[in-house]
Amino acid sequence: DCDIEGKDGKQYESVLMVSIDQLLDSMKEIGSNCLNNEFNFFKRHLCDDNKEGMFLFRAARKLRQFLKMNSTGDFDLHLLKVSEGTTILLNCTGKKVKGRKPAALGEPQPTKSLEENKSLKEQKKLNDSCFLKRLLQKIKTCWNKILMGTKEH
């Protein structure tokens, strides 16, 4: 159960939205190379009516897997702000999230030639970037939905 705090939007607009926008701004060029395929995460986790808290809780958890993936400290700092800030504002209690180490972002690849490995690594990096951008966009949309009280009825 999540008792969403700060529904007036002050904390969201002054901290979270600033960081989300900074992150999205730094990822402006990502998108044109992204495949059209739907990521499994978004098939399963939707910012649906009455499930906004659940979506944001899992999205914030997923964001943590991207920490240290990007070389710049600023990027990581903003990611951390969005992840931690979302979790704090959600104020979720009694979450039955089974103890488990975070799943690796990419699947392990069989041994391949150096050239193939380089290509696979580049594709995986692009895939992760596409996913992260989409995740941030959906987190922003979901927060806006909560704060504006817009219900898709």
Epitope: N37, E38, H45, L46, D48, K98, A103
Partner: antibody
Framework: QVQLVESGGGVVQPGRSLRLSCAAS????????VHWVRQAPGKGLEWLAA???????DYNSAFSSRFTISRDNSKNTLYLQMNSLRAEDTAVYYC???????????WGQGTLVTVSS | DIQMTQSPSSLSASVGDRVTITCKAS??????????INWYQQKPGKAPKLLIY???NVEFGVPARFSGSGSGTDFTLTISSLQPEDFATYYC?????????FGGGTKVEIK
């Protein structure tokens, strides 16, 4: 409120084709994945296919060679093109809106397809 | 494909009874700390209705007497106190791996 209405069912001869439609209302159709699920008379449920917001598709491999899912967001409509129909395709065909956990959160009333000579 | 084995296939119960339906998957339905199993109720001539999603989450508007539990391959749908409107067929469905698959159903009849 969310509403899904299937149409296009009826009696068809084996080997022929049929296109089912599902008209959606009461929600932003383009923002959700949608599925086709069928149920043969007196039998259980069988997932056929899904189409996602960006247009990518997932199929049950048992049907991917004969069935094609598509959507027209401008018309808020989902389609299922069924080719080379067989007697065993006789069933009620439901469209369903994707829900949390890739569940089927909302269902249409279903449309009956009877394949018979 | 993941096989979903539901038991029993049918049961007779009285109003007020506690009813338990089980579903066993041929492989684990757990991923990232969540269980990808959903439960539905279907009445004759009607479309199925979502009751429980992701193992234990009760769908909005569904009475609190319905609950879901389990992890890995073994899952349970419980109706704490059966009501007259609960006589129906119940299905489990896994969404961990494509193709999405359903259990064979459990028909709950009046004793």
């Amino acid at each position: 409120q969310v509403q899904l209405v299937e149409s296009g069912g009826g009696v068809v001869q084996p080997g022929r084709s049929l296109r089912l439609s599902c008209a959606a209302s009461g929600f932003t159709f383009s923002s959700y994945g949608v599925h086709w699920v069928r149920q043969a008379p007196g039998k259980g449920l069988e997932w056929l296919a899904a189409i996602w917001t960006g247009g990518s598709t997932d199929y049950n491999s048992a049907f991917s060679s004969r069935f094609t899912i598509s959507r027209d967001n401008s018309k808020n409509t989902l389609y299922l093109q069924m080719n080379s129909l067989r007697a065993e395709d006789t069933a009620v065909y439901y469209c369903a809106r994707n829900g949390y956990g890739e569940s089927f959160a909302y269902w249409g009333q279903g449309t009956l397809v009877t394949v018979s000579s | 494909d993941i096989q979903m084995t539901q038991s029993p296939s049918s049961l007779s119960a009285s109003v007020g009874d506690r009813v338990t339906i089980t579903c066993k998957a041929s492989e684990s339905l757990d991923h990232d700390g969540d269980s990808y199993i959903n439960w539905y109720q279907q009445k004759p001539g009607k479309a199925p209705k979502l009751l429980i999603y992701m193992g234990s989450n009760v769908e909005f508007g569904v009475p609190a007497r319905f609950s879901g539990s389990g992890s890995g391959t073994d899952f349970t749908l419980t109706i704490s106190s059966l009501q007259p409107e609960d006589f129906a067929t119940y299905y489990c469905q896994q969404s961990n791996v494509d193709p999405l698959t359903f259990g064979g159903g459990t028909k709950v009849e009046i004793k």
